[in-house]
Structures are given as C-alpha cells and as structure tokens.
C-alpha cells in the first residue's frame, strides 16, 4: 500500500481467483483514543471500533472511502483504490491501446518544435468517474523539471457502437535549450483513476523523436506562362523553431485528386517553392519534416488547383 | 580554399556539402547496424546514450546560433579557445565564436574517428565477421576534417592487448553510432546556419 495523495491510498493486488489479498491497517487521524467507529462509503454499518482498523482487501467491494467517526462527528477519511496485477502485469483497463507506433502504446506525445513544449494524449471509452493526474521529468535517476498542466477532455468520437474520449495534456520542460542534444529522455507518468480502480501509464521519449511540425503556411500558386506547370510557394509554420537556417525543414509537394488512388505529381524540396503539374479538380498539398532528423511529417496544407 | 561564407551555393561553402554527406553516411551505418545486430540492444530505446566528447568539446554551446544566445538555458557552459585557422572560415574577419565552433567540430570528428578505427580493428578480429564499419563513413569523416583544415595534435589510435569482447564491442558500436548521428545532425544544422548567415 502507498499514498497517492493526502488520504488516498493505493493497494497493489495480485489478481487471480481465491487470491489472499492484502492486509491493510488504517489509522484514524485524530488525537482521540476512545469511542471511534469505522464505516465504508455511504453505509452506516459499523466495520469496527478503535483508532485502527485492520481489513483484508481482496476485491473492489473492499475498496472505497473508509471513515472514522466519534459520536456522529467525522474524524478523518481514507480512500482505498485498487491496482490490479494479473500474471505479473499491471492492468491497463482504463486506457485504450492506440497501437501506434507499436502495440501497448497508451500515451502518444508530439512536439511542434524544439522549445521543450509537448502535448500528450490518450483514449478511453469511459465517460464518468474518471480522473487523471500527469507528472513529467527529464531523466528518472536525477530528474530535471518538466511542468504539466491539467489533463482535459480534448475530443469525443463515435467508433461503431462506442463513444471514444480523447484526453490531452500540455507539458513544458522548465529549462530547455532548442539546440541541445538530448541524452536523457523525457519521462511522462499518468495516474488514472476510474471509480476505485487505479492504473498508471508511462511514456519515455526524446523531444527529437516526437517532433511533428505544423503544416506550412501561406500556400500560393502562380501559373507559369505557356505551360501546365504551376509554381507553388509557402512559408515555414509560425510555431517552428528559429532560426530557420539552423532548424531547417524539408518539404513534400503533391498534386492529387480527391481519391488517394488517383494519379499524382509528387516532388520533394528543401526550398519554399516548387514547380508541379496542376490538374483540374486536383489539390496541391505541402507538408514539412525536420530536414536533418527524420521524425514525423506535418499534416498537409492544401489549396485547390483551380 | 578560403571562400566567403555569405553565399547560398553549397559549393561555395565546402563544409556544408561534406556535413550533409556525413549525416547521410552515419545514418546509413546506424540503419545497417540496427538491421545486422537485430538481436542486440541497438535501438534508441535500448541503448545508454553516451557522449564521448562530453567535457572535452563544447560543440553545441560554441556553435549556438546568435538568436539562441539570449536563451539562458543554452548558455550554461560556453567556453572560449584561441583556434582561428581553418579553411571553412570566410576571411580573417571571421568571428572568434565561429572559429571556436568549427575547431570544436573538428575535435569531435577526430575523437569519433579514433574510436571508430579502434572499434573496426576489433570487429575485424571477430570470427563471426558480422559487422564492420562502412569505409565510406570513415572517408566522409576524413573529408570533412580536411575541409575544416585545423592543425591539431594527432590522437594515437588506442590499442588493446586483451582479447576483445565482441558482444560488448558491438553494443559500444551502437552507442557510438547513435551519439555520432546526433552530433552529425548538430554539425549539419551549424553548417546550414553558417552557410546562410
């Protein structure tokens, strides 16, 4: 058993049929010694008396808010949550496996630049009685500070019969140098509590590996005289690290119709312009990637050919 | 060979072309190592990230773009030195910091070159003959060093009398290649910045 936060405790249980469970001793936070009784949740049934209460925690029915009273007055609370371990593996029931970039990916994180700011998100099908708390640091043995905000519900989607909820959090490394060469990874820890179930999820990464630039901005087309070719130009996204001559991007320019199966023109360039063949009913799209360290491509920025 | 820096043509700034080749060569070598040593811990997640140049050179700090010198977090260990020759430098007016930056890059390359050559000598003794260093990568390191053209004491190649542990050598190779790739990215960024400035 360990303390998650004040008056909230996590009991770690090996979860299998007829498991013995864990013996837990609760102590009432009071100077009083006599006349103390204990109850669980909203029940008025007295579980025991005295300053301490010893319980055997085996299942979710044994978890919940334990309250000690004296003469009708509440003295203190202890909330017990369960953390299940099945076949030596901690449960991951609350969050959905996003399976990208690999299986057992529950947290996904991205950074728009090298400033030390990043966003992580996760998915769940649970809509109520759900809380998250996020901590982060650079390295684990001698951790350096990363400040994370509160996790918020950022999107809701319908997937077949199910509703899926996306939560996200923004974090900022306290003293980040965009040019630094990372040798210690960022660690992100998410505590998830659903009703009386506790789970924790972690992710470890270098900012350089989670870079995904914003799409290029200000796409413009200039038809070339006596030709089917069009000169397309664009600019670096505002959110990208500066100076751009140091933090350079490379670009992919594509002309394609509405269907991905249609024929296309595609060219890669380090410049902020390119010449392509435009077709009726097609769009010109441009996306960006760090020129020197191949992490993710940005989303496409598009303009119609016409 | 002493060409002006302020020109966008890569040919006018020989080090830019060489640094691009360097990043390409080390990236290819790292990819080859990850494929060949698939049953060794050789991915970014599996290895310890060590920097053999730590406390010996200060490339990131010495080569910091001017725009980032206002960032307190980038300025924790800027050092100074008096090496000012070098053929990638624009002219006698080349800034002191730029000279320091390029000499730091040269020292990085020299240290990695020694490490890689020592390691290759060990790998050539491996009866499995599983992996060797790409001669192209070693050649590209050499070309960039020549383009930088700094005079510096030669570091003797380390020789070891004890029987090499090939497993450890291959893991060390992965660690070295990961670190060198990150440094090659920094070098490429620096050359691109100097070429544009």
């Amino acid at each position: 058993i360990w303390e998650l936060k004040k008056d909230v405790y996590v009991v770690e249980l090996d979860w299998y049929p007829d498991a013995p469970g864990e013996m837990v001793v609760l102590t009432c936070d009071t100077p009083e010694e006599d006349g103390i009784t204990w109850t669980l949740d909203q029940s008025s049934e007295v579980l025991g008396s005295g300053k301490t209460l010893t319980i055997q925690v085996k299942e979710f029915g044994d978890a919940g808010q334990y309250t000690c009273h004296k003469g009708g007055e509440v003295l203190s609370h202890s909330l017990l949550l369960l953390h299940k371990k099945e076949d030596g593996i901690w449960s991951t029931d609350i969050l959905k496996d996003q399976k990208e970039p690999k299986n057992k990916t529950f947290l996904r994180c991205e950074a728009k630049n090298y400033s030390g700011r990043f966003t992580c998100w996760w998915l769940t099908t649970i809509s109520t009685d759900l809380t998250f708390s996020v901590k982060s640091s650079r390295g684990s043995s001698d951790p350096q500070g990363v400040t994370c905000g509160a996790a918020t519900l950022s999107a809701e989607r319908v997937r077949g019969d199910n509703k899926e909820y996306e939560y996200s959090v923004e974090c900022q490394e306290d003293s980040a140098c965009p040019a630094a060469e990372e040798s210690l990874p960022i660690e992100v820890m998410v505590d998830a509590v659903h009703k009386l179930k506790y789970e924790n999820y972690t992710s470890s990464f270098f900012i350089r590996d989670i870079i995904k630039p914003d799409p290029p901005k200000n796409l413009q087309l200039k038809p070339l005289k006596n030709s089917r070719q069009v000169e397309v130009s664009w600019e670096y996204p505002d959110t990208w690290s500066t100076p751009h001559s140091y933090f350079s991007l490379t670009f992919c320019v594509q002309v394609q119709g509405k269907s991905k199966r249609e024929k296309k023109d595609r060219v890669f360039t380090d410049k902020t312009s390119a010449t392509v063949i435009c077709r009726k009913n097609a769009s010109i799209s441009v996306r960006a990637q760090d020129r020197y360290y191949s992490s993710s491509w940005s989303e496409w920025a598009s303009v119609p050919c016409s | 060979r002493n060409l002006p820096v302020a020109t966008p043509d890569p040919g006018m700034f020989p080090c830019l072309h060489h640094s691009q080749n360097l990043l390409r060569a080390v990236s290819n070598m790292l990819q080859k190592a990850r494929q060949t040593l698939e049953f060794y811990p050789c991915t970014s997640e599996e290895i310890d990230h060590e920097d053999i140049t730590k406390d010996k050179t200060s490339t990131v700090e010495a080569c910091l773009p001017l725009e980032l010198t206002k960032n307190e977090s980038c300025l924790n260990s800027r050092e100074t030195s008096f090496i000012t020759n070098g053929s990638c430098l624009a002219s006698r007016k080349t800034s002191f910091m730029m000279a320091l930056c390029l000499s730091s890059i040269y020292e990085d390359l020299k240290m990695y070159q020694v490490e890689f050559k020592t390691m290759n000598a060990k790998l050539l003794m491996d009866p499995k003959r599983q992996i060797f260093l790409d001669q192209n990568m070693l050649a590209v390191i050499d070309e960039l060093m020549q383009a930088l053209n700094f005079n510096s004491e030669t570091v003797p190649q380390k020789s070891s009398l004890e029987e090499p542990d090939f497993y450890k050598t291959k893991i060390k190779l992965c660690i070295l290649l990961h670190a060198f790739r990150i440094r090659a990215v920094t070098i490429d960024r620096v050359m691109s910045y100097l070429n544009a400035s």
Partner: antibody, heavy 118, light 107 residues
Framework: QVQLVQSGAEVKKPGSSVKVSCKAS????????LHWSRQAPGQGLEWMGW????????EYAPKFQGRVTITADESTSTAYMELSSLRSEDTAVYYC???????????WGQGTLVTVSS | DIVMTQSPLSLPVTPGEPASISCRAS??????LHWYQQKPGQAPRLLIY???QSISGVPSRFSGSGSGTDFTLTISSLQPEDFATYYC?????????FGQGTKVEIK
C-alpha cells in the same frame, strides 16, 4: 497484371515520320500518366514526354518540342508517339512507360526499334 | 537541364560481393531520384524510388541512399541475375533526365 504492348519494329527514311503505338491492359487507362523515352543503340535512356490520357495534357522535353506528338485514345486504351523529320540519330528503341506518379515509371513496354536509314 | 553523372561506368564484381553505384546531380534534387535495372534486350525495371524507397517484388539486397546531389545504389551481395546496367533518373524538374548508366559485370 498491368501490361504495355508496343507496336512492331519500323524502318524509316530520313525526313519521314514514325508513329509508335502502346496498348495498355490491366487497370484503367486514364488512371495513369503515360511517358515515352528512347534508347539509341548502346546508349543511355532519354526521356521524350508524357501524356495524361484523362484530359490529353502533354509535356515534351525541349529537345523534341515541335517534332514529337504524343496522343492517347481512351476507347482503345492506346497511346501513340509520333516523331517527325526523322534523322539517322533518331535510330533507337522507343519505350512507353506508365505510372500513377507523374515523374518516374513503374511499368514499361517491351520497346519498339525504329531504324532511320536511307 | 539537370545533368546526372553516374560512376563508375563499368563495375566488375565477383558474385556474392557487394556493389555500390554512385549518381551525382548537377544541382540539388532533394530525394527526387529513382533507380532502374536494365538487362540486354529488355525494358528497364524500377528498383528504388525517391532515393531509398523499396519496391515490392524487388529483392531486399537492393537499397538506395542519398539526398541533395549525391546518391548511391547498393547491392549487398551480387547474385548472377543482378549483372545488368543500372540507371538513375531525376524527377526534380522537367525534362526528366537519366544518368548514362553503370554496367555491372562479372569479375
């Protein structure tokens, strides 16, 4: 199975024209760009131009501009390359090639030898 | 026009040994570079597109690398069927241009 089948070998006199055909099978004809390139005996490849069979748009290499015409007939899934004012240096194997991507070629015809000789 | 220069023009290799062919562009072409194999009396066959992307059905011993002006096609271990002429082709701008070819011969 996508295939491009070209017309047979031709012998032409200098100053005349030649029209080589390229019939496509497998896949929808207009879903691909169609290119023509040539290869003189013992020499490398030389790109001549492309057509978009969907709308008839064409683009030619400046070297052949004014002398080459690429056309396409959607009803027969056939593309044609006509080269006029032939000279002996036009002796080559002419290839058609296609792809959904405009700038490189993933399926090639078997080639048509055109000999220009007086 | 962008000029593509291949080297060497002839490459004698022992079967089972690796081979590398170089292709240099007269100006930077990013990764807009493709490789083809051609055997005598046959049409070319696409091996690699956009410098390093492999084609399904092409053996994994063929790999490509490079960007900017310098590109390499590598055959990790030459098989008897790999003896052929190899061409690079740039797609950075029209007109599309090919290298002059590298003939890989049995040593």
């Amino acid at each position: 199975q996508v295939q491009l089948v070209q017309s047979g070998a031709e012998v032409k006199k200098p100053g005349s024209s030649v029209k080589v055909s390229c019939k496509a099978s497998g896949g929808t004809f207009s879903d691909y760009y169609l290119h023509w390139s040539r290869q003189a005996p013992g020499q490398g490849l030389e790109w001549m131009g492309w057509i978009d069979p969907e709308n008839g748009d064409t683009e030619y290499a400046p070297k052949f501009q004014g002398r080459v015409t690429i056309t396409a007939d959607e009803s027969t899934s056939t593309a044609y390359m006509e080269l006029s004012s032939l000279r002996s240096e036009d002796t080559a194997v002419y290839y058609c090639a296609r792809n959904k991507e405009l700038r490189y070629f993933d399926v090639w015809g078997q080639g048509t030898l055109v000999t220009v000789s007086s | 026009d962008i000029v593509m220069t291949q080297s060497p023009l002839s490459l004698p290799v022992t079967p089972g040994e690796p081979a590398s062919i170089s292709c240099r562009a007269s100006q930077s072409i990013s990764i807009n570079l493709h490789w083809y194999q051609q055997k005598p009396g046959q049409a070319p066959r696409l091996l690699i597109y956009f410098a390093s992307q492999s084609i399904s059905g092409v053996p994994s011993r063929f790999s490509g690398s490079g960007s900017g002006t310098d590109f390499t096609l590598t055959i990790s271990s030459l098989q008897p069927e790999d003896f052929a002429t190899y061409y690079c082709q740039q797609s950075n701008s029209f007109p599309l241009t090919f290298g002059q070819g590298t003939k890989v011969e049995i040593k």
